[in-house]
């Protein structure tokens, strides 16, 4: 899911050729190049599906495409949390999960994506024009949020074409610092490249352990994705606002997807692709921050307030959460 750049293996310079300084100037540009290639705007994608079997049941999937480690995911409906939305679930990679009705099953699908099922039990069921939002807090990117809802109409069983959705807000404090460093690095890289322009290029050889040198890969954000950064909050359709969940009406309809990545450059795959994509066992994740594999165990179906914490030996589970939301 994450953008990676694989750098060709460098052959150490021969003694006396460039010496220690030569080695440093040789490696540094490649390190900086890697940073420049991988440094892109983080993305959040949201997918909403109405189940064909349970016509008022929704599945929301959200993912974060960035290089940072996710510290918190907040799912809300009716709009962004803090802007008229209602928190449905809070997922923390170490502190666990809390959720509120009509959320039934919030869980980690991968270390950078989550899913949430909203039950359609008549009175408390969501409806088709409800807006669902996912906010990912990560380090060092900050907080990124995107919203999505089912499009007005679509063919049953088909995935709606991915469209750029707004990244609704970002905490720039963490982002600007990193961006500044990367910008400086990229400028410095250009400077080095210009300086080495008239020198003989260093000899690059494939790694001896593999017959073929891996190629550097990068994906540049499209113009559409760049523009997405400036799109304001989507207007919330109030005809089915979950202001009082006990009076919301169930909504029938076919099973179809609204796929809303924030960047057109990284489009999440449709349901068929997910089926073949290896996903960790239900409720498992890898803790990026401490480098430990932590098995979260079963994440049960929930229709009400739910909390998954792990005080047992299966993983570190400190319990002073940052949020007072459920």
């Amino acid at each position: 899911m994450r953008t990676e750049a694989q750098v060709p293996a460098l052959q150490p310079p021969e003694p006396g050729l460039e010496g220690a300084m030569g080695h440093r100037t040789l490696v540094l540009p490649w390190v900086l190049l890697t940073l420049c290639v991988t440094a892109g705007t983080p993305e959040v994608w949201v997918q909403v599906r109405m189940e064909a079997t349970e016509l008022s049941s929704f599945t929301i999937r959200c993912g974060f495409l960035g290089s940072g480690s996710i510290s918190l995911v907040t799912v809300s409906w009716g709009g962004p949390n803090g802007a008229g939305g209602t928190t449905l679930a809070v997922l923390h990679p170490e502190r666990g999960i809390r959720q509120w009705a009509p959320a039934r099953q919030a869980r980690w699908e991968t270390q950078s994506s989550i899913s949430l099922i909203l039950e359609g039990s008549g009175a408390s069921s969501p409806c088709a024009n409800t807006t669902f939002c996912c906010k990912f807090a990560s380090f060092p990117e900050g907080s990124w949020e995107a919203c999505g809802s089912l499009p007005p109409s679509s063919d049953p069983g088909l995935s709606a074409p991915p469209t750029p959705a707004p990244i609704l807000r970002a905490d720039l404090a963490g982002i600007l610092g990193v961006s500044g460093v990367l910008l400086f690095g990229c400028v410095y890289l250009l400077h080095l490249l210009r300086r080495h322009k008239h020198r003989p290029a260093p000899r690059l050889q494939p790694s001896r352990t593999s017959p073929q040198a891996p190629r550097a890969r990068a994906w540049a954000p499209s113009q559409a994705s760049q523009a997405a950064l400036h799109v304001p909050y989507a207007t919330i359709n109030t005809s089915c606002r979950p202001a009082t969940l006990d009076t919301a009406h169930p909504h029938g309809g076919p099973s179809w997807w609204a796929s809303l990545p924030t960047h057109a450059a990284h489009r999440p795959q449709g349901p068929a692709a997910w089926a073949s994509t290896p996903i960790p066992a239900r409720g498992s994740f890898v803790s990026v921050e401490n480098g430990l594999y932590a098995q979260a165990g079963e994440r049960p179906p929930h229709t009400g307030p739910g909390l998954t914490l792990f005080p047992d030996p299966r993983g570190p589970r400190a319990m002073e959460g940052p949020l007072g939301v459920r």
Partner: antibody, heavy 119, light 106 residues
């Protein structure tokens, strides 16, 4: 520090309505669900329902639908519960409680409001 | 709806002793249980959530365990200030309290 301050005791007549208040302080009011809990004399605790102050979304225990109405005033960080068509069955202590999210359910409570319904 | 059966409804123990309270759910609640201490004239106090996670500031004399449908709450080295009524709360599916256990000191 987090505090929930409830309105004082009430003596009401059957058929009347009463609005109990719960003023929150020490945290971001709009970020946490507020729950209401009933305790009849000598009996246990019963969950009435919750409200999310940020949006006004509510969810009720089936038993209390139609008799309890939850609202909030964001400007004063106050949650309210309106009890209508009071009967002697409504005589009880009523508590508001904040849902602490990842810190656990009902991590802070109000001191309670005692309601007596008598003719 | 999930029902919570709490037992015993009352118990008496000696200072310095240990007591255990049980809550049985009508279905698997996946460890989503919290325990509260309630004293007259006050709001209840959260002691433990997610079966065994001690709330900040709560002494380690209080502990919780269990899984599936059966859950246990214990107080060791009983002190006079522990006199109260204790409630379990399931929050796997909406919210349901147990009937309460009144603790007295012999």
């Amino acid at each position: 520090q987090v505090q929930l301050q409830q309105s004082g005791p009430e003596l009401m007549k059957p058929g009347a309505s009463l609005k109990i208040s719960c003023k929150a302080s020490g945290y971001t009011f709009t970020d946490s669900y507020i729950n209401w809990v009933k305790q009849r004399p000598g009996q246990g605790l019963e969950w009435i329902g919750w409200i999310f102050p940020g949006s006004g979304s509510t969810y009720y225990n089936e038993k209390f639908k139609g008799t309890a109405t939850l609202t909030v005033d964001k400007s004063s960080s106050t949650a309210y519960m309106l009890l209508s068509s009071l009967t002697s069955e409504d005589s009880a202590a009523y508590f508001c409680a904040r849902d602490g999210g990842l810190r656990g359910p009902f991590d802070y409570w109000g001191q309670g409001t005692t309601l007596t319904v008598s003719s | 709806d999930i029902q919570m059966t709490q037992s015993p409804s009352s118990l008496s123990a000696s200072l310095g002793g240990k007591v255990t309270i049980t809550c049985k759910a009508s279905q698997d609640i996946n460890k989503y249980i919290a325990w509260y201490q309630h004293k007259p004239g006050k709001g209840p106090r959260l002691l433990i959530h997610y079966t065994s996670t001690l709330q900040s500031g709560i002494p380690s004399r209080f502990s919780g365990s269990g899984s599936g449908r059966d859950y246990f709450f214990s107080i060791s080295n009983l002190e006079s200030e522990d006199i109260a009524t204790y409630y379990c709360l399931q929050y796997d599916h909406l919210l349901t309290f147990g009937g309460g256990t009144k603790l007295e000191i012999k």
